[in-house]
């Protein structure tokens, strides 16, 4: 493994940096003077960006809003004024930009209408923001217009009525395929799941709702589940919580045939003031926060077998607030496996866990090298790295940005943090780690806005400060040296960067103001990085390594989930491009099978530092409750399952004799008979 | 009672370094934190920094962050705080301050402060060429 | 890091009579805030934290109240005792940081 950012490298500068990187930026002034400016890409690698920028001014009886909208083709270099596309509309920033999915160029705007209006109207586009469509809405629309994933011209929306309207030819014309809906979302297939209110609205059925399925675009409707709260979409899995017969609890069942069949997670019950949520969910299996009985804002993290029905306790004390809904569970892109989220100790104070092999075992986050812990440390040499994310960010701790990984700069993960015992409420620092969260090392002093550029060939920051700034720091070793570029005389109110989604571009925005006494004026610099980069990388430049490599020893080294990755990484010395069409190079090896690669099935348990599953001692000899496709099941087992995405072969296969547990269902939720089909008529 | 009591005055020559001592007792020395604060003459207090006498973990104020090191003897509840590379406007009295709250962040629960609640009497650090 | 900004800088005050003391946060600092009186030729003493809870042996006469960025330190009756600075300081984000003072004067 590479080791971690060296702090007391001996920086070279690069040559000429300063004249390379002066011809690549370009200033736009955007000549109005809007309160809030909202930004847009259109497509995957078109250069495409749109610019929303908004100016309200709230009167006695009416607001008096005006927006005007900006089209760069260049990434952002150039910007056009395209108000006059949009008949210079104000447009309502809640409903935001809806972008089509993929490279389908579609975008849809919602316009503010006046008040006596009879429905909504949208501006539409289907070649990437050259022309507009005005197209008058037969309803007010609630939430923004989603696109099906599979079809960009279908499109579902809410009204503020609560009807569900479907639209099959990119919003030019409307239909309501049913009322009283309280939440619509895709599934696969143009698939369109919903649930509707029986008797008086969506806040009073809550847990009284129908479940609904229609996957002909409206013409026909199977209702899928009553008694239902809520429900969600995950990976393969549908999820519905679903209130008990005999008190006010509901329970997770799901179902992995978009509601044909219907099984009871094993998962505990919730009251009426907690809830369910799915963390992170993929083709394999799902992680679950139950949240814990009392205003306590935690929880339970548990993770899910191939089924999405048998689960395994993966972490307690998970904090989760129940009031902001803020949790800092974050999937790390750059390496397969790897989670980190924040537990609430018992002195209420937070500590950060990282997982490497999907929720199996958390641990602390190991502590940078040459760092000093501080003062939440009971032991001065010993502490750990403490990761601050969505909580620090809505608590205000100074903190701008939440951790970033990027799938395609493999083992790269940036993310403000605090060494000692515990998150403290002292000026953060960032923090790099170049193998998945293994290790770290300290990137910058105090807290910054960062971004990663050509997959990883460069990593660009701006200091986070109240006062104007105008220099950018970057650094094409993986964060170990930077160098400071000033790219404009006169600095500016930072409000963000921007680089086009996938971080493989070279290009990065910087978005501000400047401030006069009565104007403030919005302005972007945008700085190409590809004089910086202006080799392609070649083969000699990449080198090989082994993820999740611990103890390079043993033969099992680098085995996650019954099989190790080796991949080619760029060399930190190496100052070349790894390009637009840069695909990360792996090599896939499956690992042998041991007992750390099986999870124990229903009825099961593993004893805190055992191996082995053993049957639950409450268990034995008695009738579970248990339902299996909504109907009293017969379940054999031997205790073991591998675990969802395992991969191993050979080596040890938990064999023992194959129990036949008798299950009684005790879930009415749905019985075949229950479910019926309708047409719309 | 509890009680901090601090080191007498100090005069020193710009660059030297000064090293305050502040004397805990009258409770567990180990169970608080311990906050440094100074007042240049005429001035309001600035907030330099806080030591874990548990385990003798620190957080600098980023301003002091490299001239100023904070320590403690667990054997004679002391701690000691060193600043160097004096200059003349580190002229001040620098007060200990017994500091409960610390510094972790806190849950949904909130993060409750109760303030400095027992103070040293004070060291008279002079810089002067 | 948090600017905390006290007004008035001085406040002529006659015994007996109430004082009213402002402290203003450059944001949020929630109720981390505690208010200290300084005499010459004295420690800082702690009068009130948590924003609005009096400290052991302060007489009732002093009171806190505020949350998030605007707090008030109050004297209903003003003791000859009480003619001091008074200073608040935030422990919400690091580093700590004080107002700049209230002198209260004897009028």
């Known amino acids: 493994r590479r080791g971690a950012p060296a702090e007391d490298q001996d920086c070279g500068r690069l040559p000429d940096f300063i004249a390379k990187l002066t011809n690549n930026t370009h200033q736009h002034v955007f000549d109005d003077l809007s309160g809030s400016v909202s930004l847009s890409w259109v497509g995957d690698s078109t250069g495409v960006i749109l610019v929303l920028t908004t100016f309200q001014v709230p009167l006695v009886i009416v607001s008096f809003g005006q927006s005007k909208l900006y089209r760069s083709e260049d990434y952002g270099k150039n910007f056009k004024d395209i108000t006059n596309l949009i008949n210079n509309t104000f447009i309502r920033t809640e409903f935001g930009m809806a972008i089509g999915p993929e490279n389908s160029g579609k975008v849809i705007l919602t316009a503010e209408v006046s008040g006596g209006s009879r429905g909504g109207r949208v501006f539409r586009s289907s070649d990437f923001a050259k022309n507009f469509v005005q197209t008058d809405l037969p309803f007010h629309p609630l939430t923004q217009m989603m696109y099906s994933p599979q079809n960009s011209d279908y499109l579902l929306a809410l009204s503020t009525e609560n009807g569900l309207w479907v639209s099959k030819n990119f919003g030019e014309k409307w239909e309501e395929i049913h009322k009283a809906v309280c939440l619509a979302k895709w599934g696969p297939n143009n698939i369109i799941f919903f649930t509707t209110h029986v008797n008086g609205s969506c806040k009073a059925d809550l847990g009284a709702l129908e479940l609904w399925r229609t996957s002909d675009l409206g013409k026909t409707f199977k209702t899928i589940g009553v008694k239902i709260y809520s429900f969600g979409l995950g990976g393969r899995f549908l999820f519905a919580s679903v209130m008990a017969d005999k008190d006010t609890t509901r329970r997770i069942h799901v179902s992995t045939d978009q509601g044909d069949t219907w099984s009871m997670a094993q998962l505990p019950s919730v009251g009426q003031e907690q809830f369910y949520s799915i963390l992170a969910a993929n083709e394999d299996m799902v992680f679950m926060h139950v949240d814990e009985p009392g205003d306590t804002g935690f929880g339970t993290i548990f993770t899910s077998d191939d089924r999405g029905i048998v689960y395994s306790k993966s972490l307690d004390r998970h904090l989760y607030t129940t009031t902001g809904g803020e949790t800092d569970f974050t999937n790390v892109t750059s390496l397969r496996g790897v989670y980190i989220t924040s537990t609430l100790s018992e002195d209420n104070s937070i500590q950060s866990m990282i997982t490497f092999d999907q929720g199996g075992r958390w641990e602390h986050l190991r502590k940078p090298e040459n760092s000093k812990c501080d003062a939440t440390a009971k032991n001065k040499n010993e502490c750990s790295l403490h990761i601050h994310a969505s909580y620090s960010i809505s608590q205000k701790l100074n903190v701008p940005m939440a951790p970033l990984s990027e799938p395609n700069a493999v083992g790269i993960v940036i993310a403000h943090g605090s060494v000692g015992d515990a998150i403290s409420v002292m000026v953060p620092d960032v923090y790099i780690s170049d193998d998945g969260g293994y290790s770290w090392a300290k990137m910058l002093e105090g807290p910054h806005y960062y971004t990663i550029l050509d997959s990883g060939g460069i990593i660009v920051a701006i200091e986070h400060s109240n006062r104007p700034i105008n220099v950018i720091k970057f650094s094409t070793d993986e964060g170990q040296c930077w160098q400071s570029y000033v790219f404009t005389q006169e600095p500016i109110y930072f409000t963000g960067l921007a680089s086009e989604p996938g971080a493989r571009s070279m290009n990065i925005s910087i978005w501000g103001f400047t401030e006069s006494f009565i104007t403030r004026q919005w302005v972007s610099y945008t700085v190409d990085f590809k004089d910086i980069l202006e080799r392609n990388c070649e083969e000699d430049d990449y080198t090989t390594w082994l993820a999740h490599s611990t103890d390079p020893g043993d033969y099992k080294d680098g085995c996650i989930l019954g099989y190790k990755e080796q991949f080619l990484r760029l060399r930190k010395s190496s100052v070349c491009q790894n390009g637009r069409d840069y695909v990360v190079a792996k090599q896939p090896s499956v690992c042998p099978c041991s007992l750390e690669d099986f999870l124990c099935d229903f009825g099961y348990f593993r004893p805190e530092n055992a191996s082995e599953c053993v049957e639950q001692p409450e268990l034995k000899g008695h009738e579970l409750e248990f339902c299996l496709y909504g109907k009293e099941e017969h379940l054999t087992t031997n205790g073991y399952r591998k675990i969802p995405g395992d991969k191993c072969q050979g080596g040890m296969n938990p064999a023992r004799e194959v129990k036949d547990l008798k299950k009684k269902c005790t879930s009415n939720f749905l019985n075949p008979t229950k479910q019926n089909s309708k047409s719309n008529s | 009672q509890v009680q901090l009591v601090q080191s007498g005055a100090e005069v020193k020559k710009p660059g030297a370094s000064v090293k305050v001592s502040c004397k805990a007792s009258?409770?567990?020395?180990?169970?608080?934190?311990m906050s440094w604060v100074r007042q240049a003459p005429g001035q309001g207090l600035e907030w330099m920094g806080i030591i874990n006498p548990y385990g003798g973990s620190t957080s600098y104020a980023q301003k002091f962050q490299g001239r100023v090191t904070m320590t403690r003897d667990t054997s004679t509840s002391t701690v000691y705080m060193e600043l160097s590379s004096l200059r003349s406007e580190d002229t001040a009295v620098y007060y200990c301050a017994r500091d409960p709250s610390g510094i972790a962040a806190a849950g949904p629960a909130s993060r409750y402060y109760y303030g400095m609640d027992v103070w040293g009497q004070g060291t008279t650090v002079t810089v002067s060429s | 890091e948090i600017v905390m900004t006290q007004s008035p800088a001085t406040l002529s005050v006659s015994p007996g009579e109430r004082a009213t003391l402002s402290c203003r946060a450059s944001q949020s600092v929630s109720s981390n805030l505690a208010w200290y009186q300084q005499k010459p030729g004295q420690a800082p003493r702690l009068l009130i934290y948590?924003?609005?809870t009096r400290a052991t042996g302060i007489p009732a006469r002093f009171s806190g109240s505020g949350s998030g960025t605007e707090f008030t330190l109050t004297i209903s009756s003003l003791q000859s005792e009480d003619f001091a600075v008074y200073y608040c300081?935030?422990?919400?984000?690091?580093?700590?940081?004080f107002g700049g003072g209230t002198k209260v004067e004897i009028k």
């Open positions: 009258g409770y567990t020395f180990t169970s608080t934190y």
């Open positions: 948590g924003a609005s």
């Open positions: 300081q935030q422990a919400r984000l690091g580093p700590w940081t």
